[in-house]
């Protein structure tokens, strides 16, 4: 025979073709072998001009030989070489799909590889490529766009060899936080206007709570839990009212100690206090803020001061909440009763933001001692909280 060639080469098959011998022959003897692959010999009919080679090893150079037989006679042997394709990785899957991230996993090919080429493309035509190492079988995609269809493809590499690509399709979820647990998550969902929002305590859709979000102060993402601005709301309320909350979230209000406890139990929170009086402003930030549960009488933790208002909350750190009908302070007298408010009183206060609006009598008004002392009732005050790691979360959103 003559003109031995191979065609239709894949990672495991090839088709051998040849020109028949001029003389009539009984059979052709085909043999093929590769590096680290034992020789296989097959005999086919003398009127055959092609033979399908199967069960080949991927990415392997094979030597193919063929000769003709007629009775006891044998022709000379002709030889051809071919290399099988690199086989593809298998079972490419996208898991842990979020609004900005997904995890791609796959099974390696049988052949050894020098790496993988990953290509992922969004429906709008944005294409990204990345090459990963030979021992890698998963890759975290980041900085994806929410609510977007993606096609991810992977190809095995071995030196100059490239396998066929396999692909998977997935769609990122629409919102970063479908059930935001605080205003920072609402903001990271793309809501940047201050106002009323529904949050879900612990991300549980059954635990909905309407809150006012401050989306502008120092980067935004704050749950406002106290506002004093005009004296229309009565803050000389009892224990039950302070536990549950009261007032109009758009105006003067108190969010409630039970809610504060549940929110601050979700993670590490920081406190911000904004004060305004006759055109002057001041603020205080505490990088650790939490409120205990009812068993602790809503014990306050507030640490790590920075700001311009002065560190007046330090005096109240570690104190339980007091109202006129539940006296938990360390004074002989009832601080809430004496100062017509409620707070984490000690004996009695440096801060009295729930005091009597507009009352400039000593210690009776809306006071922040280290800013305006105890004989000036501050016109505007807000207390608000957000996760201490908000800056990191915000950075992630901006990159996306």
């Amino acid at each position: 025979p003559s003109g031995l060639v191979t065609a239709n080469i894949t990672d495991s098959e090839a088709l051998a073709r040849w020109q028949p011998a001029i003389a009539t022959v009984d059979s052709y003897v085909i043999s093929y072998t590769g590096e680290k692959v034992p020789e296989i010999t097959r005999t086919v009919s003398g009127n055959t001009v092609e033979y399908a080679l199967t069960d080949l090893e991927p990415a392997t150079e094979y030597t193919l030989r063929i000769f003709a037989e007629k009775g006891p006679q044998k022709s000379s042997t002709i030889t051809a070489k071919f290399t099988t394709d690199l086989d593809s990785p298998r079972d490419l899957t996208a898991t842990e799909v979020q609004s900005e991230t997904a995890l791609l996993t796959w099974r390696p090919p049988r052949a050894s590889v020098t790496g993988y080429l990953l290509v992922y493309e969004s429906v709008d035509g944005t294409v990204k490529e990345v090459i990963v190492g030979p021992d890698t079988t998963s890759y975290s995609l980041a900085d994806l766009s929410p609510s977007t269809h993606y096609t991810a493809k992977i190809q095995a590499l071995n030196g100059p060899l490239r396998s066929n690509m396999i692909q998977t399709i997935f769609t990122t979820i629409g919102l970063l936080y479908p059930f935001p647990k605080d205003c920072s998550q609402a903001m990271l969902n793309g809501d940047t206007t201050s106002g009323l929002y529904t949050i879900y305590l612990n991300g549980d859709k059954a635990e909905a709570l309407e809150v006012f979000c401050d989306m502008t102060s120092d980067g935004g993402g704050w749950i406002v839990f106290l506002r004093r601005k005009n004296g229309r709301e009565n803050f000389y309320q009892n224990w039950k009212a302070y536990a549950a909350g009261f007032g109009d979230r758009r105006e003067e209000f108190w969010l409630g100690l039970d809610n504060l406890n549940k929110i601050t139990a979700q993670g590490q929170y920081e406190l911000r206090v904004d004060l305004r009086d006759h055109g002057e402003t001041a603020f205080a930030v505490y990088d650790k803020f939490s409120v205990g549960d009812a068993k602790t009488r809503y014990k306050l933790k507030v640490e790590g001061y920075s700001g311009t208002a002065g560190d007046s909350m330090a005096y109240h750190n570690g104190r339980s909440f007091s109202t006129f009908d539940k006296d938990t302070d360390s004074a002989i007298t009832n601080c809430a009763l004496s100062y017509k408010g409620a707070f984490w009183y000690r004996n009695c206060h440096r801060v009295n933001l729930m005091g009597r609006y507009g009352d400039n009598n000593h210690s009776q008004g809306v006071n922040w001692f280290h800013w305006k002392g105890h004989e000036h009732s501050i016109q505007f005050a807000e207390m608000k909280l957000r996760p201490s790691n908000f800056r990191n979360l915000e950075g992630r959103r901006k990159r996306a």
């Epitope: 330090a314 005096y315 004074a331 002989i332 004996n347 206060h349 440096r350 210690s363 105890h374």
Partner: antibody, heavy 120, light 107 residues
Framework: QVQLVESGGGLVQPGRSLRLSCAAS????????MHWVRQAPGKGLEWVSG????????YYADSVKGRFTISRDNAKNSLYLQMNSLRAEDTALYYC?????????????WGQGTMVTVSS | DIQMTQSPASLPTPVGDRVTITCRAS??????LNWYQQKPGKAPKLLIY???NLETGVPSRFSGSGSGTDFTLTISSLQPEDFATYYC?????????FGQGTKVDIK
């Protein structure tokens, strides 16, 4: 146990300088404000200076403002008082005291004191 | 600055008697008042903080009361180890100031 140990006192001439140190142990030093309180021989107690836990805020009595500098090294659990332009009326036993909240404070732990005598 | 005035300056008292020391602030200080005990050659020791709270380890015969500008330290039954000088201190504002002291000695 919680302990404060002062050092650095001595006899010094008017106008000269002295640096007092206070070594703290037994508590998380940077969680607390620290203070210097002095007591002239046979007299009462006088607060001199205070510093917040982080060292970011400092406070002084009018009698020492501009002459004394309070500082702390939280890595070394140490408090310092740099006293410049010393006067005879600065003669006193100087106590290092641990605060509880910061500015406007309660002193719950005291050292044994170090004597500073300013005399020519 | 807030002035703290203690009275009396000296209080000779027999063992077992009740002792009352008063302290007056020159301005309203809520309950921001502390009491200290100092024995000769020793550092002061905190007895009462926030006008009425007993510091850990202090005997219950010591008590404090008052609010606003007038405060009292009471020793219900004077013991030999209680002979010392007692100081009040306002922690309402900086500079925190001390009273001039009350010396309780043996009668």
């Amino acid at each position: 146990q919680v302990q404060l140990v002062e050092s650095g006192g001595g006899l010094v001439q008017p106008g000269r300088s002295l640096r007092l140190s206070c070594a703290a142990s037994g508590f998380t030093f940077d969680d607390y404000a620290m203070h210097w309180v002095r007591q002239a021989p046979g007299k009462g107690l006088e607060w001199v200076s205070g510093i917040s836990g982080s060292g970011g805020s400092t406070y002084y009595a009018d009698s020492v403002k501009g002459r004394f500098t309070i500082s702390r090294d939280n890595a070394k659990n140490s408090l310092y008082l740099q006293m410049n332009s010393l006067r005879a009326e600065d003669t006193a036993l100087y106590y290092c005291a641990k605060g509880t909240v910061g500015e406007g404070d309660t002193f719950d732990i005291w050292g044994q004191g170090t004597m500073v005598t300013v005399s020519s | 600055d807030i002035q703290m005035t203690q009275s009396p300056a000296s209080l000779p008292t027999p063992v077992g008697d009740r002792v009352t020391i008063t302290c007056r602030a020159s301005q309203y200080i809520q309950g921001f008042l502390n009491w200290y005990q100092q024995k000769p050659g020793k550092a002061p020791k905190l007895l009462i903080y926030d006008a009425s709270n007993l510091e850990t380890g202090v005997p219950s015969r010591f008590s404090g009361s008052g609010s606003g500008t007038d405060f009292t330290l009471t020793i219900s039954s004077l013991q030999p180890e209680d002979f010392a000088t007692y100081y009040c201190q306002q922690s309402y504002s900086t500079p925190q100031t001390f009273g001039q002291g009350t010396k309780v000695d043996i009668k």
